[in-house]
């Protein structure tokens, strides 16, 4: 479960609300910052099938988050 | 069941305008948001706009920048694409696409949409 900076938002409108857990290849969140004023969770799909942003207030999207950060804490 | 039902196209002359709709029903709509995509005869289809109902956000290809706006009732569950100054190359058939989860990259990306109208011709003659 990475975290890394960028310069902007990277996700725009809806969320998927749910991705199912054997089509996820990695998580990465990246909280609150200057760049960005929310917290995203982009999904990282298997067989080169792209990214998806979750979200954040869904709840496999709460779970990510409560796993990376008890993991880093 | 899922439909998005495109209408408002035809026959205008270059320089004229018109006023698509996509009407949208069988899902909640704030959990997605709609692309416009267009397709010419031999061509690949490209996304012209997209609107995001949930915050208001849009995004226009360059293409179409300063000619085409996006908007959406929320009440109605309908997209609406406004288009002016049309020319000869904006001839094409019309679609509206409803997805979520985008990234800031992919909101041209076909794959991402998860339904889709049956389109409408827009034929704009000089």
């Known amino acids: 479960f990475p975290m890394f900076k960028r310069g902007r938002c990277l996700c725009i409108g809806p969320g998927v609300k749910a991705v199912k857990v054997a089509d996820i290849e990695k998580a990465s969140i990246m909280y609150p910052s200057n760049n960005c004023d929310k917290i995203e969770v982009i999904i990282t799909l298997k067989e080169n099938k792209g990214q998806r942003c979750l979200n954040p207030k869904s709840k496999q999207a709460r779970l990510i988050i409560k796993k990376v950060e008890r993991k880093n804490f | 069941e899922v439909q998005l039902v495109e209408s408002g196209g035809g026959l205008v002359q270059a320089g004229g305008s018109l006023r698509l709709s996509c009407a949208a029903s069988?899902?909640?709509?704030?959990?997605?948001?709609i692309g416009w995509f267009r397709q010419a005869p031999g061509k690949e289809r490209e996304g012209v706009s997209w609107i995001s109902s949930s915050d208001g956000s849009t995004y226009y290809a360059d293409s179409v920048k300063g000619r085409f706006t996006i908007s959406s009732d929320n009440a109605k569950n309908t997209v609406y694409l406004q288009m002016n100054s049309l020319k000869p190359e904006d001839t094409a058939v019309y679609y509206c696409?409803?997805?979520?989860?985008?990234?800031?990259?992919?909101?041209?990306?076909?794959?991402?949409?998860?339904?889709w109208g049956q389109g409408t011709q827009v034929t704009v003659s000089s």
């Open positions: 069988g899902f909640t709509f704030d959990d997605y948001a």
């Open positions: 696409a409803a997805g979520a989860g985008f990234l800031i990259t992919t909101i041209w990306t076909t794959q991402m949409y998860d339904y």
